[in-house]
Amino acid sequence: MSSKYPRSVRRCLPLWALTLEAALILLFYFFTHYDASLEDQKGLVASYQVGQDLTVMAAIGLGFLTSSFRRHSWSSVAFNLFMLALGVQWAILLDGFLSQFPSGKVVITLFSIRLATMSALSVLISVDAVLGKVNLAQLVVMVLVEVTALGNLRMVISNIFNTDYHMNMMHIYVFAAYFGLSVAWCLPKPLPEGTEDKDQTATIPSLSAMLGALFLWMFWPSFNSALLRSPIERKNAVFNTYYAVAVSVVTAISGSSLAHPQGKISKTYVHSAVLAGGVAVGTSCHLIPSPWLAMVLGLVAGLISVGGAKYLPGCCNRVLGIPHSSIMGYNFSLLGLLGEIIYIVLLVLDTVGAGNGMIGFQVLLSIGELSLAIVIALMSGLLTGLLLNLKIWKAPHEAKYFDDQVFWKFPHLAVGF
């Protein structure tokens, strides 16, 4: 007989998720309306394409990237979709309430959907550190807390530091990474004897994870340029991101081979390292004045990613209980920091070049933004971790970590788990 959700979760999840969905529908009913002023339909189509790219990145890219576990690939893809769908709805409302609410109504535009998709992407990055150890009811909590924390962080940064949409959204890499790592730190860590094989990767899921990485690789320029407000900035962002991810692929594959005693290439290294350039270049993609600089960044990011993938999993597994193949968290934390540092360096160069003698002030502002992003990520991540540990959510037992059969109906399987 195929396995079932524990009875308690069968009661808890549908009730919790459907009640939440009903509440969201009511909020949309009372507080939102569409932007009715679209004079230019051609512009609408072009604008929609960017949003579509972001949705592909989220649903297919990150969905499949996290699906490399031998016995947890179904859950990875479907739970990602579930979180994306829920996250986008809540992010649209939250962004609207934070930025437009004095007017009484939240106007929904393609841009607000774009922003919401990017906010939801944050959860999909973070969740890599905890997938397989939590159920859907817990993931709902994680979505709500993280989207709320990111929305508030972005609002605070834009108000205090006068930062534009692109800059305050590019903190997403660092924010998502530290949020995910701090949630993972709070969850039960040790894997009981006999279940270690479940968090290992298998060939077919690894292939689908590579497919996810390819989708992310293709659409990363769209992500980095989506919130820029002029065509020339967007063009720069697209070009620089493309050069950076191109170089990071070459570096990832070569570096992975170099890091192995027999010169073999690790799938896990490649999955994440191919994206390294896109993350590292994100914050300053519109500012980098020439291709060679973006390419150097891609090279450095690729090397850091491969180095991190080689030496950090041991530490992360011991301290945070994150499996070897879930390297997005520490990868993004390192590369996000690299990206922020590059931005500060460019800021200093600009300040020196303009001769206005305000270097300290400029650097202080940027460090303030980054510190705030990390602090809020850690605090909200710890809060989420503590919430997820509550008995009410009926978390999977450690023996049932990384197992699709706990959550899915497999009619062809005769043996339950």
Epitope: I160, Y165, S230, D350
Partner: antibody
Framework: EVQLLESGGGVVQPGRSLRLSCAAS????????MHWVRQAPGKGLEWVAV????????EYADSVKGRFTVSRDNSKNTLYLQMNSLRAEDTAVYYC??????????????????WGQGTLVTVSS | AELTQSPSFLSASVGDRVTITCRAS??????LAWYQQKPGKAPKLLIY???TLQSGVPSRFSGSGSGTEFTLTIASLQPDDFATYYC??????????FGPGTKVDIK
């Protein structure tokens, strides 16, 4: 030569609506962000709204949020400002302005480099 | 960021060196522009990025500052320069606030 020409102003009663237009020529309209700025009689300049080059995002001053809507038709090279629920304090000359993005040493800067001649909106009973 | 300008009114003679100050309530890096406006006319851009002269503007106009304090200097006031001057923050996030203006009058 870059030209911005506002129209649609006039006298209107409180609570009524008015739609302003700004016809652009002499540049590639679809690659520039556009703004509305107003100036009440004898007062300073007040920024009202912005619409991004592709129309994907619009932002407003708190004083007009929920009442004014900015839009553009890139095929007609025209910018619009739909003003609903007008109040006496909305009486002003309304200017449209082009936002140009320029490169500094590394960072990008913005400037309102071209302005229309303005159109007067009077809200009075 | 709120902008304040000082002085709000200034009397000067032709040939004088005139300095107008604009202060921002928050740091706005170098994202500040200066405009000149004459009665019944649209504003005219003089300076952007705090210190860059707009093409076609006479070199007697100059701007400086960064962060929270900015100045517009007219090296030698000409008859055509009697007008109202506004600073504007063009930082990345709306609203793109204008200062209250400084009226330069003939002494």
């Amino acid at each position: 030569e870059v030209q911005l020409l506002e129209s649609g102003g006039g006298v209107v009663q409180p609570g009524r609506s008015l739609r302003l237009s700004c016809a652009a020529s002499g540049f590639t309209f679809s690659t520039y962000g556009m703004h509305w700025v107003r100036q009440a009689p004898g007062k300073g300049l007040e920024w009202v709204a912005v619409i991004w080059f592709d129309g994907s995002n619009k932002e407003y001053a708190d004083s007009v949020k929920g009442r004014f809507t900015v839009s553009r038709d890139n095929s007609k090279n025209t910018l619009y400002l739909q003003m609903n629920s007008l109040r006496a304090e909305d009486t002003a000359v309304y200017y449209c302005a082009r936002e140009e993005v320029v490169r500094g040493v590394i960072l990008w800067s913005r400037k309102f480099d071209y302005w229309g001649q303005g159109t007067l909106v009077t809200v009075s009973s | 960021a709120e902008l304040t300008q000082s002085p709000s009114f200034l009397s000067a003679s032709v040939g004088d060196r005139v300095t107008i100050t604009c202060r921002a309530s928050q740091g706005i890096r170098s994202y500040l522009a200066w405009y000149q406006q004459k009665p019944g006319k649209a504003p005219k851009l003089l300076i952007y990025a705090a210190s860059t002269l707009q093409s076609g503007v006479p070199s007697r106009f100059s701007g400086s500052g960064s962060g929270t304090e900015f100045t517009l200097t007219i090296a030698s006031l000409q008859p055509d320069d009697f007008a109202t001057y506004y600073c504007q923050q063009l930082n990345n996030y709306p609203p793109f606030t204008f200062g209250p203006g400084t009226k330069v009058d003939i002494k």
